[in-house]
Interface confidence: medium
């Protein structure tokens, strides 16, 4: 059986204050079943960033539609980006139970601000 | 109706600990970051500490950090703050504050619990 | 750290009178503005949020303007349960979250 992959391809992106960041994940497999997450830092400080299961998320989106069968493509999109933002973002797999398990974490991706042109 | 209700305060002596409680209803309590913010008597608003919906991410205001611990159940849906170390300049009114989005405004208050550091 | 300052401390106003609140924040916070309420020994409560947007059930008698370091918030007819401190706060860089050092509005 082949590994599963979590796939940030963009190891930094840079947005202007005020613009929209794509941040792409994929995975390799559909299987075994269970959610991604998104997280800013990591350890066991890390925020929660996006959880399509529940979570009040206003300005973050999914790229894809994450409840169509057989997706593999989890990236998001921040929108109204601020300096607040900065940070490396970790699109992270889990094992569906009670609770999930983490199972594997994409390499992460550095989301930098840089100050609106005037 | 979103209700955020705190307990817990009192009156202290400097170096001694506090645990405030700030129970939460009418919302999906494990949805959204919640903070602490205080109001020393006559001063405007500080904020004190903020904490991540899944409680993983937690910040602090220089002025405690090291000294007062943010956590939440989410199973209870009740929001803490523990204070040690506390000292004169601790003595506020602490009120819990739900924030809209994870990056965001306080869009609820409660209606605060006063701490009172004195010998 | 982004530093708000609220002027006037202090405003007294008629009732039916345009109160006018100034914050002017030390560097730029794009929208990410809100204005609170606190009445005397009452929690504050949210009025505007993304510097121009009114919260859920506050009259529209109250409206915020601005972007970058220059806000307004404005009471275009001062009821006298209008008589609060009035704070603004930035959520542009955090942490920490940071709030101006209020505006007084009495009244005459």
């Known amino acids: 059986e082949e590994e599963l992959q979590v796939i940030q391809p963009e190891k930094s992106v840079s947005v202007a204050a005020g613009d929209s960041a794509t941040l792409n994940c994929t995975v390799s497999s559909l299987i075994p079943v269970g959610p991604i997450q998104w997280f800013r830092g990591a350890g066991p400080g890390r925020e929660l960033i996006y959880n399509l299961k529940e979570g009040h998320f206003p300005r973050v989106t999914a790229v894809s539609d994450p409840t169509k069968r057989n997706n593999m493509d989890f990236s998001i999109r921040i929108s109204n980006i601020t300096p607040a933002d900065a940070g490396t973002y970790y699109c992270v797999k889990f094992r569906k139970g009670s609770p999930d398990v983490e199972l594997k974490s994409g390499a992460g991706t550095e989301l930098s601000v840089r100050a609106k042109p005037s | 109706d979103v209700q955020l209700v705190e307990s817990g305060g009192g009156v202290v002596r400097p170096g001694e600990s506090l645990r405030l409680s700030c129970a939460a209803s009418?919302?999906?309590?494990?949805?959204?970051?919640m903070n602490w913010v205080r109001q020393a008597p006559g001063e405007g608003l500080e904020w004190v500490s903020r904490?991540?919906?899944?409680?993983?991410?937690?910040d602090y205001a220089d002025s405690v950090k090291g000294r007062f611990t943010i956590s939440r159940d989410n199973s209870k849906n009740t929001l803490y703050l523990q204070m040690n170390s506390l000292r004169a300049e601790d003595t506020a009114v602490y009120y819990c504050?739900?924030?809209?989005?994870?990056?965001?405004?306080?869009?609820?208050w409660g209606l605060g619990a006063p701490v009172t550091v004195s010998s | 750290e982004t530093v708000l300052t609220q002027s006037p401390a202090t405003l007294s106003v008629s009732p039916g009178e345009r109160a006018t609140l100034s914050c002017r924040a030390s560097?730029?916070?794009?929208?990410?503005l809100a204005w609170h309420q606190q009445k005397p020994g009452q929690a504050p409560r949210l009025l505007i949020y993304?510097?121009?947007n009114r919260a859920t059930g506050i009259p529209d008698r109250f409206s915020g303007s601005g972007s970058g370091t220059d806000f307004t918030l404005t009471i275009s007819s001062l009821q006298t349960e209008d008589s609060a401190v009035y704070y603004c706060?930035?959520?542009?860089?955090?942490?920490?979250?940071?709030f101006g050092g209020g505006t007084k509005v009495e009244i005459k």
């Open positions: 904490i991540d919906s899944g409680g993983g991410g937690t």
């Open positions: 706060q930035q959520y542009y860089y955090w942490p920490p979250y940071r």
């Open positions: 504050a739900k924030q809209y989005d994870w990056n965001s405004f306080f869009d609820y």
């Open positions: 560097q730029t916070v794009g929208s990410k």
């Open positions: 993304d510097a121009s």
């Open positions: 009418g919302f999906s309590f494990r949805s959204y970051a």
